[in-house]
């Protein structure tokens, strides 16, 4: 019971998450115009990873689009390429988590391939919301630099009667959305890894191995299944012939903790 | 079409306060701000505050203790106040309608005289 | 707040002359999220309120004739009028929509010979 629910809940708080990165990424308040110095603007600035807008007192918002690739700073690209990563990988660990979870019932899918895919899903989420984090964090990097640069030049060369005030970006909406968005990913990932190991059944060697003959010898090895770390082969953890004999542990699944080397 | 009308008291006392309402028609309040400017006689244009669409406002530094601009969507009306007139607040006083975009005032009224004397 | 200077104050031209007025800010009027200038021209004639020629430092108004022409950008900008008739005769004023309070210049006075 506490394993549904620790997985369940980790497929939760890891959808909410995705849901948040999704939107961190298609939102245009990455960066807001710092108003520190000049509350009494008329027009606000705010940029995103895909278009850049201004909003007049008037109601009245314009937002054009980045329209170039190549004239963007690689840090942008860096950022918006690790976004998409986040949300690829969250989507797809959200694929395989709904079919791993214990209560939906899909065919006869064992207990050892569902801890496999709640392992894998948690895998994603965690790397998932890594992503998100580190997107984030870079933009708020750039955005940190680029801060102090543009108060340094504000400070000098302020001669004569005309002053050229720079516009300033500090955090927006957007990095507190994805900060949070990935690290409730990371948490639901790492839920999904907890819910993995009560999933997967022990390793039990039998002396003894019930089966129904079906006319023809066939060898077992004992030790039954062993939930691997992946979707790979492994030879080890594999029956090596199925037969119309099941072994004990096919017949009843016992939810237990495994141990992962 | 557009129009903007003031209406005033005309004349005022020193040290009472001034209400003039601003009518208008062809647009909504609820689409369009609506800004106050006076012209005291001879002398040029001074930007006193506006309302917003939305009901947020913006008023002149040197004015905004003593202002007050408020807006009735549902009659299409929008009402300035201010405190403590003095003689040098003599002036025509006009609103105009905010033009969306770029923040210009493209509609005007005919403006209102408002004259501070005992 | 930002101080708007107009000049000159007035001038007298005759009528086909081509005029050229400037107004000059305490500080830049562009915005550089859209590259925009936030200036707005306005015109007064005697006993009437101002009526709105260029908005966005260069933009003419609908129905404002083709001989007003505003240019200009960041703290210098420049009403000209292309060839100045008889009804042109106003007083000229600039004014700043980017920074509260949208303060307007001292206006430039034009007569017709």
């Known amino acids: 019971m506490a394993v549904t629910a620790c997985q369940g809940l980790g497929f939760v708080v890891s959808l909410i998450g995705i849901a948040g990165i999704i939107a961190a990424t298609c939102m245009d308040q990455w960066s807001t115009q710092d108003l520190y110095n000049n509350p009494v603007t008329a027009v606000f600035n705010y940029q995103g990873l895909w278009r850049s807008c201004v909003r007049e007192s008037s109601g009245f918002t314009e937002c054009r689009g980045y329209f170039t690739l190549l004239g963007l700073p690689a840090m942008l690209q860096a950022v918006r390429a690790l976004m998409i990563v986040g949300i690829v990988l969250g989507a797809i660990g959200l694929l395989v988590s709904i079919f791993a979870l214990k209560c939906i019932r899909i065919g006869s899918m064992e207990d050892s391939a569902k801890a496999n895919m709640t392992l894998t899903s948690g895998i994603m989420f965690i790397v998932s919301g890594l992503c998100a984090i580190a997107g984030v964090s870079v933009f708020a990097n750039m955005l940190v630099t680029n801060f102090w640069m543009s108060t340094a030049n504000m400070y000098t060369g302020m001669g004569g009667m005309v002053q050229t005030v720079q516009t300033r970006y500090t955090f927006g909406a957007a990095l507190f959305v994805g900060w949070v968005a990935g690290g409730l990913t990371l948490i639901g990932g790492v839920m999904m890894c907890i819910a993995c190991r009560g999933l997967a059944p022990e390793e039990t060697n039998y002396k003894a191995v019930s089966y129904h003959a079906s006319g023809h010898s066939v060898a077992y090895k004992p030790g039954g299944f062993k939930a691997s770390t992946g979707f790979g082969s492994n030879t080890k953890n594999k029956k090596i012939y199925d037969g119309g004999a099941r072994t004990e542990d096919e017949v009843q699944s016992y939810p237990s903790k495994h141990d992962y080397v | 079409q557009v129009q903007l009308k003031e209406s005033g008291p005309g004349l005022v006392a020193p040290s009472q306060s001034l209400s003039i309402t601003c009518t208008v028609s062809?647009?909504?309040?609820?689409?369009?701000?609506v800004y106050w400017v006076r012209q005291p006689p001879g002398k040029g244009l001074e930007w006193l505050g506006v309302i917003w669409a939305g009901g947020s406002t913006n008023y002149n530094s040197a004015l905004m203790s003593r202002l007050s601009i408020n807006k009735d969507n549902s009659k299409s009306q929008v009402f300035l106040k201010m405190n403590s007139l003095q003689t040098d607040d003599t002036a025509m006083y006009y609103c105009a309608r905010d033009r969306g975009r770029l923040l210009s005032m493209d509609y005007w009224g005919q403006g209102t005289s408002v004259t501070v004397s005992s | 707040d930002i101080v708007m200077t107009q000049s000159p104050s007035s001038l007298s031209v005759s009528a086909g002359e081509k005029v050229t007025m400037s107004c000059r800010s305490s500080?830049?009027?562009?915005?550089?999220?859209?590259?925009?200038?936030?200036l707005a021209w306005y015109q007064q004639k005697p006993g009437q309120p101002p009526k709105l020629l260029i908005y966005?430092?260069?933009t003419r108004e609908s129905g404002v004739p083709d001989r007003f022409t505003g240019s200009g950008s960041g703290t210098d900008f420049t009403l000209t009028i292309g060839s100045v008739q008889a009804e042109d005769l106003a007083v000229y004023y600039c004014?700043?929509?980017?920074?509260?309070?949208?303060?307007f210049g001292s206006g430039t006075k034009l007569e017709i010979k």
């Open positions: 966005g430092a260069s």
């Open positions: 062809g647009f909504s309040l609820t689409s369009y701000g």
């Open positions: 004014q700043n929509v980017h920074f509260f309070p949208f303060t």
């Open positions: 500080q830049s009027l562009l915005n550089s999220g859209n590259q925009k200038n936030y």
